[in-house]
Every structure is written in structure tokens, then in C-alpha cells.
Amino acid sequence: AKLGAVYTEGGFVEGVNKKLGLLGDSVDIFKGIPFAAPTKALENPQPHPGWQGTLKAKNFKKRCLQATITQDSTYGDEDCLYLNIWVPQGRKQVSRDLPVMIWIYGGAFLMGSGHGANFLNNYLYDGEEIATRGNVIVVTFNYRVGPLGFLSTGDANLPGNYGLRDQHMAIAWVKRNIAAFGGDPNNITLFGESAGGASVSLQTLSPYNKGLIRRAISQSGVALSPWVIQKNPLFWAKKVAEKVGCPVGDAARMAQCLKVTDPRALTLAYKVPLAGLEYPMLHYVGFVPVIDGDFIPADPINLYANAADIDYIAGTNNMDGHIFASIDMPAINKGNKKVTEEDFYKLVSEFTITKGLRGAKTTFDVYTESWAQDPSQENKKKTVVDFETDVLFLVPTEIALAQHRANAKSAKTYAYLFSHPSRMPVYPKWVGADHADDIQYVFGKPFATPTGYRPQDRTVSKAMIAYWTNFAKTGDPNMGDSAVPTHWEPYTTENSGYLEITKKMGSSSMKRSLRTNFLRYWTLTYLALPTVTDQEATPVPPTGDSEATPVPPTGDSETAPVPPTGDSGAPPVPPTGDSGAPPVPPTGDSGAPPVPPTGDSGAPPVPPTGDSGAPPVPPTGDSGAPPVPPTGDSGAPPVPPTGDAGPPPVPPTGDSGAPPVPPTGDSGAPPVTPTGDSETAPVPPTGDSGAPPVPPTGDSEAAPVPPTDDSKEAQMPAVIRF
């Protein structure tokens, strides 16, 4: 069967019907359907006016305008808001009421596209394998990235989050039109990786998506990741404005000037330094989502009531931090180079600026505890990777899972750890699953380009597609049309259960309490350390006129939820203020070159997981780790849960102005609507209340935006805002 021309709100579209094998199955593929009008720089996306006749949707459109990997030119286009659809078809009737999976690509909110890298004439984000193996509709799309997607003045002049609004427009378009392609508009699953995983998370938390999303999967990135929220957007806006010759004294004049500046100039005005970094890469990515008081009405930690009815899978790769650690400390991948205690201490201190000397020493001691018994270079290098994995990915993901679970009503929560080792032959043997290594398996590359892979890779890919698509169908990764290797139990605050995804899976793949000691350290011990003053915490910013962008100031509130710590029955305590931090790491779409498989298979190279031609650019923002409840001005640590205590502890309130509210389970009060004033972030009910989602506070044309304190511009960012 085949669809032929499909009528959408824009008009008729015609794709291509691709036959699969001899049994009569096929897939209808539509590439390049506009879901919004051509963009205007630094403005919200607008509906597409439509077309007459039948649109031939047979080729991918250009990606959104972005810098090349060398950052000396641009590619892509301003006219970029297009989506792609894969619809599996059987022999007889056209498909009806299929589950829909919408992919959001990663790339540090800086790069990427809906189709991804092209390798062996096969695009990374080609939805065909998922669609045909899982019998689901797959949708991918482009959204604006970099300054054009995320530049913000922190107020109504340039509220920011244009890229997030593009994503929302695509989701809403799918909701309105997918029935015509055979999809079920009431069964939409978002999935994404890295910045895409964080975007998935943010979309579930935004009140704009109420009723649009049924399920969600975040791979290696959540809204609470320290690189996701920019707390000082004005700092970065001014940097770009200075570069392109716009006035910086008055935000309104600066905004007007930026809007009429050549978009290519805006894009190239921002460069992420890739070598010789004085601080961890995380410090340098400036253009990421902001709390705008409207699309993201409050700190994400306070918005989990909005996701109470959305089934959720979140997980990380066991060495997600490897690519970033190897950029921050190149010795990691070099057998002839050593990692010293001094090297690691320096790295740790750069991630723990706000806690000063005590933060650096305590963190260093916790992570180097094993070095006495095993001083080998392999162990030391693994420690560095574990440290960045924990801070950038694992701990924030654990907190997000705990928050989702604590707020969920009927919704289910599942956690995973992807551990199938990287195929990069240039990496040391001890390297596990690096950042973005999971993408190729989710998208079925071992089947699409089989010569680049081994049977065990196909086993992993088959399992992931089965779990992911079963989940999209039913909300339970075990139930659906696809057989799975073992039962995946839901995550609960009591068991902290997670599925370890490897080439051999059985009942022992279901594990509990991942890295509990380190999770406890970040959310309890580290949190309790006093925050040092600006002066004590401020390393000297980069000087000279190098391309290295100076590090922006940090926000002034340290907050975040306490996840369950393994043996406590107490639900996590949501924090109350800025969870906050910087941007996102590349994500699979950023572009490592193709790599030949290792071993003696003689097989051709493994498709790259990126799409630009160099190792992915890690995140860089101003925070480097998962958020944690504020410690207050008193320095008194929050009382940790004791295991069998009744209500969870309430940490001190810090300087955010609003005390955190622990989940109560039976609150009927509606969430507080944010006012746009960052001093009082709204705290939604976190239990199983029937409370409505937190609504936006204004119209999207002039969203209230929390003010940014521009007075601390010389200050370095706090990397870990726990």
C-alpha cells in the first residue's frame, strides 16, 4: 500500500514510496515539508502560509544557518523549518493510527540538522529502520541553533528560546496533521539525544505543549543538565553585539540592531574555542535556552508537574563524559601521556568554583579515593571521565528521573544506562560508551549499513529499537509488537532501578542505584558546603584578543532537587531557584569523522555519529553539574533524609527568595504562575495533585523574562550549581 498525495494544513504533499523486499511492505518517505514560515532573525516562528498544487517532498532541505566545524564560515539557511516523515506500510491497506516518534537532534544547541550526517549514502537520522522495524511513524525536523536560535537579552527585547519555539511548532504541526499520514495524534513520543534529550525534557515541561505529548525519551541530556539553561544571556548577547558593531548600552537599541544584522555575521560572531582552553569547555557555550517567563516559565526543576501525565524514559551512556574529558584533558586518550593529581585537581576546581577551596578538595578526595589502591593511569583516566560523566549527565538525569517519578500521576518512568563500548579504534581499550554512541543503534545503522558493524551491534540495535518503539506504542518498553531481550522494570524512588543496555542482556541487566555514593555526594555533601564570595570564587578570565570567549557571569542562586539516595523512601525535594547553567554538548550530530571498526573483522568503517566533521563540541556553559538544593546564606547544610523518616527534609532556601516545597503527594493547589521575576520561581505541586500545568505568563510576543544581573560581568561562571 502507499499513501500518494497527502493533504495537510499547508496543502497537498507527495513523497516517495520505497519498496522493502519481496513481501510487499514499503515505507512512504516525505522530506522537506515546511512546518513554519521562513524565519525572521531573532523572532518567534510563524505559521506557514501554505502552497497551491502538490508539494514534492522528496529531498531534505538545508539545515538551519550555523557555523561550520572550523567556525570560519557558515552553511545552512535561514529558511530551514522543515520536517521529514517516514510511514511504514503493509501490503494491503495504508497504515492507520500508528504511534508517532518525533526526533530532536542534539549538537550543543549550536549545530545539527534533522537528517544528520551522511555516511555511505545513509543519513544518521534516517527514520526508516525505526519506522519499519517498530511499525511507528518517525518524524525529524530542523530548528534554529546558535545565536539565531538562542540569543537573548534576558528581557522582552529579545526573549530568546527561538529554537525551542521552532521545536514546539513542529510538534504542534505533527499533532494537527499526522492523522492524514496514518498517525495517531494522541500518541506522540518525543525522543532526542544530548541537546536534543534536554530539548525533549524542556518541551515536556513547557506549558505550551499541554496535551500534545504522550511520552518522551531523553538520551544523555535533560532539562536539569548544567549546560542547558543560560543564566546570563545578556552577557553573551553583548559579546555578539560588540562583534557585529551593535550598541550595547541600551537593550532595546541593541535588540533592534541585532535583528537587522546579517544572520551570517551573527552566527560567526560567536566562536567556541576548541583547543588551548583555560577552563572546561562547558564554560564557553553561551547560546542555549533561558528561563523566559513564558515558554519556560520558571526554573525547570519547578515545572515537573507539567510532565505528570507523560511517560518518560531517561538515561545516559556509561562514559558520556569521555569526549568532554578528552578535550579538557587531552592526555586521556594518549597512552604515552599521564594524568597527574595536579591535572585532575585543576579540572575539579574549575568545575567547583562556587564552593571554593573546600569544594575542590572535597570533590577531589571523593573521586580519587580509589587511587591509593589502584594508581594506574587507566584508573586515573577513568576517574576523570567518570567525573565529567557524573557532573554533565548522570547526576542531572538521576535528579530528573526522581522529579518525574515524584510528580507523576499515571505516567511511568524508566531509566537506562547504555554501556555498549565505543567503536572508535583510536580510543584506549578501557573506553566505554562515549557521548552520542547510542544514536547509531537507535537509528538502526547496523542494519542500514551492515558492512560497518558486527552481529553483536545488530543485537544491541534490535533491542534498543524494540524497547523504544514498544514504549512509543504502549508506554511500557516491554509491551508492544517487538520482542525484547529482558524485562525492563520501571524506575521508582525506592529502587532507583535501571536497565543496562549491552550486547548480552538478561535478568541481570536490570540493576539498582547507579553510582549512589557519587549521587549522594553531589546532592547532599557538596550541596552542604558553604558557597564562597564572588571574589574568592573568581579565577582570572582569559585575556588577550584570542578567539576564546570570556566566561560569563553566573547567576546568583544555587539550587536543585535532592534525588533519592538509594535507601531512602523519601521523595526528592525540589529546589527552588535557578538550577542553572550553560549550554549543551554536541550530540551526535556534531561530527566525528567515520571510524573503521576495530577488531579483525576487516569490515568497512563505522558511520560517524556526528555531522560536521570533527569531534563533537562539548557543552560549555556556566555550571557543570546537576543542581542541588540551595544552602542558604547561613551555610547550614540541609538535613539529609534518614531512610524511614516521614516527610522529606526541606533544605534552606538560599538567596532565591522562595523556599523549596517538598513533594506532598496530596496537594490540590495549582502551581504558582511565574511572574517573570526570577527572585520567586514558582513551585508547582510535586506530588500526585490534580493541579494544572504552570501556564505561561504573558503572550509570546513580549514574554516576561527574569532580569539578569549585569553588574557582575567580570565574574566567572560557577560551573557546578548544586
Epitope: 495537510t8 501554505g50 504542534a172
Partner: antibody
């Protein structure tokens, strides 16, 4: 100027079929989609479906799927809407309506054709 | 399908009055169109793309809204404005509101 002229009123028995025509003039016939909308006596407007006169592509509302067929004749700049297995509830005024621009609203309407289904 | 709820279903007003008709869509939509229909006549396009006035339509008619809530406003009713008004959305399966009959008080 744009004109859409529809065929005259019809009286049909239940189970029969009816074919209503809509002749277009004053613009390039193949350049704009043509929709069919009906209105039962004293009721609101109901979308039936759409045809692209350029290539003949059609899309029908779920409710009418299997019962409605839209065709066009480019030589006479005419579109047709045939509704089969008629029942009394199909008694209505049937309108053809042309897109105004892009995919947007229905900017030009025919005068309507009353179809009465009665035994 | 997208559900459209138009209110009120009928309305009595006098010449010179300001009148507002609302239409709520679920889920949210891109654009709303508004039509006027007089007895025995075909509908006539008034407002398209939410707020754009069709040529030849008097400026006392205006449209606004976004997402789920849309409004048609007649700033000062004239005798010829007494008619039935319909909202209309374009998705892959277009739908109309139930109509608002505007009568002379």
C-alpha cells in the same frame, strides 16, 4: 473575476448517487485547490474534501471516506463531487469553494446546489 | 480532528454596538478564518490568517488571537452585519465552528 458556477438542484432517492459540478472561470484552473463544503438545513458548515485540479490529488474527510469521489476535467475547468449511497441526512446545500491563496481560507464560493434525498 | 467551540451560539445586539465572537480550538492551531453568511447565500470570507481583512470588507471587522483562543470583533454594528458568523481552521481535516447567529435586539 473569479466565478464558480454550480449545477442545479437535485432530488434523489435513498441509496442513489448524485454528481454535482462546479465550473470555474476567471483564473488559472489548475493553480488552486477546490474544496467541497455542505450545509444541512438550519445547520452549520461541514467540510467534505478537497481536490488539486492540477494533478487530481484528493483528500476526503473521514466521515465521507468511501462514499465520496472528487474528479476534475481540465479541458472544461470543471470539478465534480459524487456522493453515493445517499441517505436522508445527506439532504443539504453543497458548495464548491476555491482557496483564496496558499493553503489559507476559502475565498471564493459557488452559489450552492441543493441536494434533496427523499423516498 | 481539531475541535472548534464557537460562542455564543446566538447574540442580540443593536446598531452601533461593539460585538465579540470567540472561537476556541483544541489542540492549538496556526491560523483562524472567519466567514459571514446571510440566509440563502454562500458564506463570504471576512478575515483570514487570524487578523487579515479580506479586500472589500469594512474595517469595523477585526480578528485576533493565537494558539487556542481567537476572536472576531465588530467595532460598531451596522444593519447589514446581522447574519451568521463561522470560524474555520485549516488542518489536514478542516473544520468550522457551530456558528453564531447575530440578531437585531
Amino acid at each position: 473575476q473569479v466565478q464558480l458556477v454550480q449545477s442545479g438542484a437535485e432530488v434523489k432517492k435513498p441509496g442513489a448517487s448524485v454528481k454535482v459540478s462546479c465550473k470555474a472561470s476567471g483564473y488559472t484552473f489548475t493553480s488552486y485547490n477546490m474544496h467541497w463544503v455542505r450545509q444541512a438545513p438550519g445547520q452549520g458548515l461541514e467540510w467534505i474534501g478537497v481536490i488539486n485540479p492540477g494533478d487530481g490529488a484528493t483528500s476526503y474527510a473521514q466521515k465521507f471516506q468511501g462514499r465520496v469521489t472528487m474528479t476534475r476535467d481540465t479541458s472544461t475547468s470543471t470539478v465534480y463531487m459524487e456522493l453515493s449511497s445517499l441517505r436522508s441526512e445527506d439532504t443539504a446545500v453543497y458548495y464548491c469553494a476555491r482557496d483564496y491563496y496558499g493553503s489559507s481560507p476559502l475565498g471564493y464560493w459557488g452559489q450552492g446546489t441543493l441536494v434533496t434525498v427523499s423516498s | 480532528d481539531i475541535q472548534m467551540t464557537q460562542s455564543p451560539s446566538s447574540l442580540s445586539a443593536s446598531v452601533g454596538d461593539r460585538v465579540t465572537i470567540t472561537c476556541r480550538a483544541s489542540p492549538s492551531i496556526s491560523y483562524m478564518n472567519w466567514y459571514q453568511q446571510k440566509p440563502g447565500k454562500a458564506p463570504k470570507l471576512l478575515i483570514y490568517a487570524t487578523s487579515r481583512l479580506q479586500s472589500g470588507v469594512p474595517s469595523r471587522f477585526s480578528g485576533s488571537g493565537s494558539g487556542t483562543d481567537f476572536t472576531l470583533t465588530i467595532s460598531s454594528l451596522q444593519p447589514e452585519d446581522f447574519a451568521t458568523y463561522y470560524c474555520h481552521q485549516r488542518s489536514s481535516s478542516p473544520t468550522f465552528g457551530q456558528g453564531t447567529k447575530l440578531e437585531i435586539k
